[in-house]
Structure formats: structure tokens, C-alpha cells
């Protein structure tokens, strides 16, 4: 029961996280005009990964896409790439994890296969979350650098009679969405990996074989040995993972020659 809960929760958390990563990637507010000195502005600028927008006090908003690929800063391209990789990995991870869910039965898929798929999706979620966090952090670093550069320009460029207002940009809502979403995806991935340990088959039910020692009538039943997957636990702790009674569908099948390859 605990395994199913952990796996299910991991899936849901990752799903929310990946939805957040997609939302952050599509959002226009990656950087927003700094309003520290002027909290109410007649023209408000904000920028995303794909377009920049201007909202006038009249309520009109105009957005322009970045219709160039080569003319964009390398850092912006890198952030785009990281976010897209994160989304793609996350989407594949979601697809894999759906089939890996313990509560979903697909044909005669065995627990070992589900364990492997859960681990795979978990790793994908972890990498996806890290990509998103990395992408957002790179963009944030870029903003901080540009912020202080433009601040320096504001105070050095006032020698003339006419002031030119330098627009400074600060963290937009998308950055916080991205960080949170990346974190959730990462946590979901870790939960899937933890759930994978409990999904690994508990024991291998080899048929008892009698060994007759000369002169004695003692039969040895090698029932205490398990096929090791690296995530196995002591058979005494079985109930921690399966929650006690099993349904008919959950009865473990006898191993075939294809198991534990």
C-alpha cells in the first residue's frame, strides 16, 4: 500500500511539476521592468523566452516575438534548450510512469518490469527538474548581471542635460514558477525512485528440491534465498511494502526464464 501511495504521489507531484515547467516556459514574465524607483508606470515592459511585451497604462498590451534565431543571446538560447529538454524528458517520464503505476494493470506486466519503468521515469523526472532549475537559474543570473550593469549605466550616463531612462529588468513570475515546478518534478522523481525499491519482486518461489544426504533423511528447502535486484528487502519486511493482503490480480507469478535479466 505504501509503495502504491509513494508511486502515485510521485506521479502526481511530477505531473504538477511538469505542467509548471511547461507553463513557465510559455510565460511572458521571465523578466519584468524594475519598478523600484517608479511603482506606477505608464509603460510597463516584460519579457519571456519567446517574445517581449509592453503594457501601456491605457490597458493595451503589445507583444512581439523574437523572429530571429541567430541574433539572440547565447544564454537565452541555452535557457530555451534546457527548458525544452526538461519538458521532453518530463513528458516521456510521465508516459513511462503511467504504465509503471502499480494500480494500473496492462496485460501480464510483471512487477520487475514495473519497477524498472518506475526507476526510469523517476530518473527522467529528476533530470527534467534539474534542467528546469538550471534553466531558470541561468536566466536569473543573466538578469542579475544585466541589472547591475544597467544600474551602473544609469549613474554614469547623467553627465548631459537630458536624462535617458535606462530600463532595468528584475525577476518575473515565470522564474518563481520555474523554480517551484523544477523542485516539484525533482521531488516527484525521487519519490518514484523510492517507490521503485518497494516494487521489486519480494521473493523467488523456486519449487522445493529434496537433497538426500547419505545415511540421513533430511530434506533441505532453499526458500530463504531471493533473486537480487539491488532493491530487495528482507522477506520478513514484506508487509511494509504490500500492505498485507493481496488481491487476486497481485498474486506474484512464478519466475520464467526471462525474469531478472
Amino acid at each position: 500500500m505504501a509503495v502504491t501511495a509513494c508511486q502515485g504521489l510521485g506521479f502526481v507531484v511530477s505531473l504538477i511539476g511538469i505542467a509548471g515547467i511547461i507553463a513557465a516556459t510559455c510565460m511572458d514574465q521571465w523578466s519584468t521592468q524594475d519598478l523600484y524607483n517608479n511603482p506606477v508606470t505608464a509603460v510597463f515592459n516584460y519579457q519571456g523566452l519567446w517574445r517581449s511585451c509592453v503594457r501601456e497604462s491605457s490597458g493595451f498590451t503589445e507583444c512581439r516575438g523574437y523572429f530571429t534565431l541567430l541574433g539572440l543571446p547565447a544564454m537565452l538560447q541555452a535557457v530555451r534548450a534546457l527548458m525544452i529538454v526538461g519538458i521532453v524528458l518530463g513528458a516521456i517520464g510521465l508516459l513511462v510512469s503511467i504504465f509503471a503505476l502499480k494500480c494500473i494493470r496492462i496485460g501480464s506486466m510483471e512487477d520487475s518490469a514495473k519497477a524498472n519503468m518506475t526507476l526510469t521515469s523517476g530518473i527522467m523526472f529528476i533530470v527534467s527538474g534539474l534542467c528546469a532549475i538550471a534553466g531558470v537559474s541561468v536566466f536569473a543570473n543573466m538578469l542579475v548581471t544585466n541589472f547591475w550593469m544597467s544600474t551602473a549605466n544609469m549613474y554614469t550616463g547623467m553627465g548631459g542635460m537630458v536624462q535617458t531612462v535606462q530600463t532595468r529588468y528584475t525577476f518575473g513570475a515565470a522564474l518563481f514558477v520555474g523554480w517551484v515546478a523544477g523542485g516539484l518534478t525533482l521531488i516527484g522523481g525521487v519519490m518514484m525512485c523510492i517507490a521503485c525499491r518497494g516494487l521489486a519482486p519480494e521473493e523467488t518461489n523456486y519449487k522445493a528440491v529434496s537433497y538426500h544426504a547419505s545415511g540421513h533423511s533430511v530434506a533441505y528447502k532453499p526458500g530463504g534465498f531471493k533473486a537480487s535486484t539491488g532493491f530487495g528487502s528482507n522477506t520478513k519486511n514484506k508487509k511494509i511494502y504490500d500492505g498485507g493482503a493481496r488481491t487476486e490480480d497481485e498474486v506474484q507469478s512464478y519466475p520464467s526464464k526471462h525474469d531478472y535479466v
Epitope: Q33, N38, V40, T41, A42, V43, N45, Y46, Q47, S52, C53, V54, E56, S57, S58, G59, F60, E62, R64, V162, Q163, T164, V165, Q166, T167
Partner: antibody, heavy 118, light 113 residues
Framework: EVQLVQSGAEVKKPGASVKVSCKAS????????VGWVRQAPGQGLEWIGN????????NYNQKFKDRATLTVDKSTSTAYMELSSLRSEDTAVYYC???????????WGQGTLVTVSS | DIVMTQSPDSLSVSLGERATINCKSS????????????LTWYQQKPGQPPKLLIY???TKQSGVPDRFSGSGSGTDFTLTISSLQAEDVAVYYC?????????FGQGTKVEIK
Amino acid sequence: EVQLVQSGAEVKKPGASVKVSCKASGYTFTSFWVGWVRQAPGQGLEWIGNVSPSDSYTNYNQKFKDRATLTVDKSTSTAYMELSSLRSEDTAVYYCTRLSSGNSFDYWGQGTLVTVSS
Amino acid sequence: DIVMTQSPDSLSVSLGERATINCKSSQSVLNSGNQKNYLTWYQQKPGQPPKLLIYWSSTKQSGVPDRFSGSGSGTDFTLTISSLQAEDVAVYYCQNAFSFPFTFGQGTKVEIK
């Protein structure tokens, strides 16, 4: 046809308040901000403030912040500008306008003359 | 506050001649986000409310005759009437639409010589 129709001329005593109305028609009232601009006799234009009919959010010229109150009534598509503690220098024609692209005022009311005299 | 200064205060031009009005702002009204200058021009005839002519420094409002044009960037702007007509006699105002408070120039009176 877009129209902004303002209330009639007012004569007020110093220290009193005046409330000018502006009824909008010919467009979706909540889609455009309403601005207020005044013009003293023989003088230039002076911006008082803007109000959003959709959420009653306002932007004021600091000069009028304490004395001017901009409100809207969505049900009647009417904007109001109330100016308190009137002084003789507040004698002017008060215009309501519609705020459009480029933060420009594209349609104007006919104006309301407010005379402050003792 | 951005101070808008127009020149000249009044202008006498013969019919059919070119009229040029200048407007200077104390700060740049160029928005870096969309590279647009938030400067607006209005025409006010005696006894009438102002009429919008040009916004974003050079974009003509619909219905405005082609003889009106706006130019300039940053802090210096110009309104040009390529061929003055009798109906163009009015006071012309420039407006800062870039930052609060919105401010207007003192106006330029255009007359026929």
C-alpha cells in the same frame, strides 16, 4: 459612434466640491480607461488622472491626488470626477477623455466649465 | 516630471506652405521594450476639445489628413503640416505619454499669414 457626453457648467464657491459626470456610448465602456484633463481659460492642458472602468483602478497626477476622486458606474457607463476644496485657480474647462493606444486620448467629451467664484 | 517645451509659441504660415512645430522633452520618451516614442500630438480649434492627430510620435490617428506627419525620437520631435489649409488654424499640443504624470507642451498657435 463613440461619444462622451459631460454634465453641464457649474458655479461653485471656494472650499466647495464639484462632481462632473461623463456618460460614454458607442463602445464597450469597460474596455477603455477614462482620463480627465483640465484647461484653465487661455491656458494649456493639464492631466488630472485616469480611471479603469473594469476595476476602478486609478492613476492620479500627484498635484490632484488629495483633492480629486475618480469613480465609475459600470451600470450606466458613466465616469465621475469629483474635485474638493475648490480654489479660484480651479476655474477651468474639465474634459473627460478615452485612453487608447500609445497612452493617447482619442475621444474627448465636450467639456464642462467649472467656475470657482466667491 | 517630464517637461515638454514647444517652439515656437506661435507660427504664421501662408496657405499651402509647410508648417513645422517642434517639441522637446526633458527626458527621453523612447521605450526600450518596443522601441516606440510615447509622444502624442493634438489639435485644438477655438471652442472645441482637443483632437488626437498622432501617437507613438509618428502613427497617424485614423481620419487624420495625410498632410500631417510626426517625426523624431528620444527627446526631440516635430509635427509637420506639409501644405497648410484654412481648417488647420488651431493650437497644437504635444504630450508626454511615457511616464506619469502625463504632461503637455504649452501649445503652438498656428495662423495663416
